[in-house]
């Protein structure tokens, strides 16, 4: 079957996101990938979206993330814009209303996004072959 247009949009957004280094990409998020053995794909997407939403809700107006320079300010705003887009698309792909995120493990946002990108690329290669 054809790859979902949403999947392509997610990969494009992740490509942009993983190129970015901002003051806050080193902050930690819940690592939902650490123990995702018994988790369905839809649950993984839902939980990833939940983690991203928690992150940008908490840090969107964080003065440490906004920084002191115009470049830092705009890079952070761009990061938040991309995270919101990613969140929206992941919810669309998951098709679930809510999902628990209880893991204790943490990873940096940067590593979280890299891991998510790997998963999405694997999914894309399967559906496009």
């Amino acid at each position: 079957h054809k790859c979902d247009i949403t999947l392509q949009e997610i990969i494009k957004t992740l490509n942009s996101l993983t190129e970015q280094k901002t003051l806050c990409t080193e902050l930690t998020v819940t690592d939902i990938f650490a123990a995702s053995k018994n988790t369905t794909e839809k649950e993984t997407f839902c939980r990833a979206a939940t983690v991203l939403r928690q992150f940008y809700s908490h840090h969107e107006k964080d003065t440490r993330c906004l920084g002191a320079t115009a470049q830092q300010f705009h890079r952070h705003k761009q990061l938040i814009r991309f995270l919101k887009r990613l969140d929206r698309n992941l919810w669309g792909l998951a098709g679930l209303n809510s999902c628990p995120v209880k893991e204790a493990n943490q990873s940096t946002l940067e590593n979280f996004l890299e891991r998510l990108k790997t998963i999405m690329r694997e999914k894309y290669s399967k559906c496009s072959s």
Epitope: S16, A68, T69, A70, Q71, F73, H74, R75, K77, R81
Partner: antibody, heavy 123, light 107 residues
Framework: QVQLQQSGPELVKPGASVKISCKAS????????IHWIKQRPGCGLEWIGM????????RLNQRFQGRATLTVDESTSTAYMQLRSPTSEDSAVYYC????????????????WGAGTLVTVSS | DIQMTQSPASLSVSVGDTITLTCHAS??????LSWFQQKPGNIPKLLIY???NLHTGVPSRFSGSGSGTGFTLTISSLQPEDIATYYC?????????FGGGTKLEIK
């Protein structure tokens, strides 16, 4: 081509309110911040503030805090600036301009400007 | 706020001259500086961004240099159409600020 079209000149009484517009065309309106600049006759340029058309977030120069309000109408790709209780000091040309960025803000600058709106405050 | 100081305030020039305009920032702004040209009754026109990058369509006789707190705009072999006021603008931090301008006048 990329354009910012501003509304015409305004004659406003001291203490009244004036709202000027800036209509964008030729590019994705929500992708670039719109900034507003003031220029008094024979004087230099002063940054008023900026607005993100994608979500309406604004940032203002403290000198204009509480007096200038920046808004956008995404449906018409138009940015607005409202000045409350203007005085003769607010008689000026007001420009809107787009902040263009490259490579995730590796560089950014004002590349396109509106023609300016002359606001005259007089009783 | 970062103060931007331009010198001289005005300059008498002749066609063919090579001239240098200076801009000083009150604190380190790295290379976050733009130069604009404005002719009477016209809008400001971007010449240089990020201290030394020539904007698209701007003649190569314009060049910018500097970093930190000191910047220069050089116009080599000045043309009649270059008679205008030149402004520097810092894009390092908000609020963005402009210099007071340097006005060129024909001798």
């Amino acid at each position: 081509q990329v354009q910012l079209q501003q509304s015409g000149p305004e004659l406003v009484k001291p203490g009244a309110s004036v709202k000027i517009s800036c209509k964008a065309s030729g590019y994705s309106f929500t992708s670039y911040w719109i900034h507003w600049i003031k220029q008094r006759p024979g004087c230099g340029l002063e940054w008023i503030g900026m607005i993100d058309p994608s979500d309406g977030e604004t940032r203002l120069n403290q000198r204009f805090q509480g007096r200038a309000t920046l808004t956008v109408d995404e449906s018409t790709s138009t940015a607005y600036m409202q000045l409350r209780s203007p005085t003769s000091e607010d008689s000026a040309v007001y420009y809107c301009t787009r902040l263009k960025e490259y490579g995730n803000y590796d560089s950014f600058y004002f590349d396109v400007w509106g023609a300016g709106t002359l606001v005259t405050v007089s009783s | 706020d970062i103060q931007m100081t331009q010198s001289p305030a005005s300059l008498s020039v002749s066609v063919g001259d090579t001239i240098t305009l200076t801009c000083h920032a009150s604190q380190n702004i790295d290379v976050w500086l733009s130069w604009f040209q404005q002719k009477p009754g016209n809008i400001p026109k971007l010449l240089i961004y990020k201290a030394s990058n020539l904007h698209t369509g701007v003649p190569s006789r314009f060049s910018g240099s500097g970093s930190g707190t000191g910047f220069t705009l050089t116009i080599s072999s000045l043309q009649p159409e270059d008679i205008a006021t030149y402004y520097c603008q810092q894009a390092h931090s908000y609020p963005f600020t402009f210099g007071g301008g340097t006005k060129l006048e024909i001798k």
